[in-house]
Structures are given as structure tokens and as C-alpha cells.
């Protein structure tokens, strides 16, 4: 089938002790091969500081996955979710302020 670029959505959830969990979700993409990773100041975080979900079919012939990491509250602007899929790539910031959702479709 033809390439379907992912929809990327970044969310934050509050956790204790001044830390937050940021989650980057990629959905509705095809084929299933994708790179999704968190970067701090433009550098990929080491694997042991990130959690990945499996790449799973979403029932529409496309796929979905996610990656999450825990960061210090107030440092959100230093972190981005980096996505590579079928030769395309994109960088997605952590939402700032009161906005806890950010999504973008790659073309």
C-alpha cells in the first residue's frame, strides 16, 4: 500500500516530586517501520530513560505506537519528540503552559 504519514500527539501528565511524564504518540501510519524518540537539547535520550509501546495495528490498516519519558517540571521546552517515517522526519515540542496537548499530521 501507499505511505500514510503518522499523526503525532504530545501530552503531559503530572506526577509527584516536581516531575512530569511526557508521552509522544504516533498513530494512523503505514508502513509500520517508524523511529520515535525523545530528545533533550537536540540529543536523543538514552534508551534506559525512555519507555516504548509496541507498534500495533489500529484496525484501519495502519499502525500506532508511543514513547514516554519523565522530565523535570519547568524544563519542558528542552525536550522534543523526534519522528522518522518513510524518509520523512519531524520534531514535536512538549506543550507549554496550560496546554497539555499538541498534535500534527505529517504530509
Amino acid at each position: 500500500g501507499s505511505t500514510v504519514p503518522p499523526m503525532v500527539n504530545v501530552t503531559c501528565s503530572e506526577v509527584s516530586e516536581g516531575n512530569i511524564t511526557v508521552t509522544c504518540r504516533a498513530s494512523s501510519f503505514y508502513p509500520r517501520n517508524i523511529t520515535l524518540t525523545w530528545r533533550q537539547d537536540g540529543v536523543s535520550l538514552s534508551h534506559n530513560t525512555q519507555q516504548w509501546g509496541d507498534v500495533l495495528p489500529d484496525g484501519n490498516g495502519t499502525y500506532q505506537t508511543w514513547v514516554a519519558t519523565r522530565i523535570r517540571q519547568g524544563e519542558e521546552q528542552r525536550f522534543t519528540c523526534y519522528m522518522e517515517h518513510s524518509g520523512n522526519h519531524g520534531t514535536h515540542p512538549v506543550p507549554s503552559g496550560n496546554s497539555h496537548h499538541h498534535h500534527h499530521h505529517h504530509h
Partner: antibody, heavy 119, light 108 residues
């Protein structure tokens, strides 16, 4: 002003060890990623190691992996490079560099400290 | 690892000449993670162009950078004496970070 001052270089025998230090001043050290970059005499630049602000992301060049250890002491504003099993090809000027958080890249460099590995 | 190949290795240029050097990556990298440094003999390198096309503070406007994917370049529109130096490209798209082998620019 940002200042990075390396120390600890000198003559080391093959197979020996050496610990380099980089004293940082003029910026909030504990919020910046740091690196070591080296340059052999009359050769090009070679990135050696990276450590992020919280010391939980560390990367090494393949040529030094398993022999060199990068670390930092944030309260003392100091970056370290512990070098073991040194070889003649490790002879180089070692630069401490600060990572640029907004754009990436090495925005500030020290003057370097020379490590010579020779019998 | 991503290998950066710079060409030419050496360039002898006349004053006022346009100078272009290239940096070719062994696999595609994001333009956000490609930078250039200038180094003169006996001195530490300086960040010269960041994120492919942005001039670092104090860099003259005769310098420019461009590129995407696997192909990047640095151009000096009109060569001046102070531009004689070695220029290195560098990527942090993927660890291990790497430098190109450099392009040495001299005055003819």
C-alpha cells in the same frame, strides 16, 4: 563570560590511565550538556563523549567505548574524562565543549589539554 | 555510525573568489542536526554555522550554509584573507556524533 579550562594532560605510557578535568564558569553548569572532543596532531576533530545535564544520557565514540568514562560533578562545576588502557592513537589535544541547548552544536570550547601516549 | 565526507580536502582560493565546500552524509540526517565549525592553526574551533544555515554570532554575512538529507554545503561568497582556515561539518542526528575530515581553505 563562559570559561572552560581543561587540565590533567601530560605524558602517559601505553596501557596507562589519566583523568582529565574541565572547570566551567560563567554559566549554570548543571543545566547544560557537555562533551569531550579531541584532535590528534595535524589531524581533524574527533568527538569523544557526551553527557547530558543530569548524567542519565551518556554517549561515546566507538574508538573509546569501554576505555573512557565521562562524568560530571555539578556542585563543583566540573566535567571529567577518565581514560584507561591508553594507546598511542589516543595522543591528542582534548577539548571540553559546552552543548548549545537551543540549536545544538558545541557553542563554547576550552583551550584544550594535550595528552601524549608514548613509551 | 554516520560518516561525513567533506570535499575538497584542500582549496586554494584567490581573494574575492566564491568558495563552496560540501559535506556528504552516509545516511540521511535532519538539517537541524548539522553544524559547521571554523578552526585556525593554534586555536580552538568555533561554531560557525548552526542547524545547516544559521550563522553563529559574529560570522560575516558572506558565509552561508544550505542542504538537506545527505548533502550539505558551506559557501563563502567572496573570499577574504581572514577566511583562511579549516572548516568541519558535524552531525548529532544519531550517536555516535561525528565530524567530517575537514576542508582546508588557503589564500592563493
Amino acid at each position: 563570560d563562559v570559561h572552560l579550562v581543561e587540565s590533567g594532560g601530560g605524558l602517559v605510557q601505553p596501557g596507562g590511565s589519566r583523568k582529565l578535568s574541565c572547570a566551567a564558569s560563567g554559566f549554570t553548569f548543571n543545566t547544560f550538556g557537555m562533551n569531550w572532543v579531541r584532535q590528534a596532531p595535524e589531524k581533524g576533530l574527533e568527538w569523544v563523549a557526551y553527557i547530558n545535564s543530569g548524567s542519565n544520557t551518556i554517549y561515546y565514540a566507538d574508538t573509546v567505548k569501554g576505555r573512557f568514562t565521562i562524568s560530571r560533578d555539578n556542585p563543583k562545576n566540573t566535567l571529567f574524562l577518565q581514560m584507561t588502557s591508553l594507546r598511542s592513537e589516543d595522543t591528542a589535544m582534548y577539548y571540553c565543549t559546552r552543548w548549545e541547548p537551543v540549536t545544538g552544536g558545541f557553542s563554547y570550547w576550552g583551550q584544550g589539554t594535550l595528552v601524549t601516549v608514548s613509551a | 555510525q554516520i560518516v561525513l565526507t567533506q570535499s575538497p580536502a584542500f582549496k586554494s582560493s584567490s581573494l574575492g573568489e566564491r568558495v563552496t565546500m560540501t559535506c556528504t552524509a552516509s545516511s540521511s540526517i535532519s538539517s537541524s542536526y548539522l553544524h559547521w565549525y571554523q578552526q585556525k592553526p593554534g586555536s580552538s574551533p568555533k561554531l560557525w554555522i548552526y542547524t545547516t544555515s544559521n550563522l553563529a554570532s559574529g560570522v560575516p554575512a558572506r558565509f552561508s550554509g544550505s542542504g538537506s538529507g545527505t548533502s550539505y554545503s558551506l559557501t563563502i561568497s567572496t573570499m577574504e584573507a581572514e577566511d583562511a582556515a579549516t572548516y568541519y561539518c558535524h552531525q548529532h542526528h544519531r550517536s555516535p556524533f561525528t565530524f567530517g575530515s575537514g576542508t582546508k581553505v588557503e589564500i592563493k
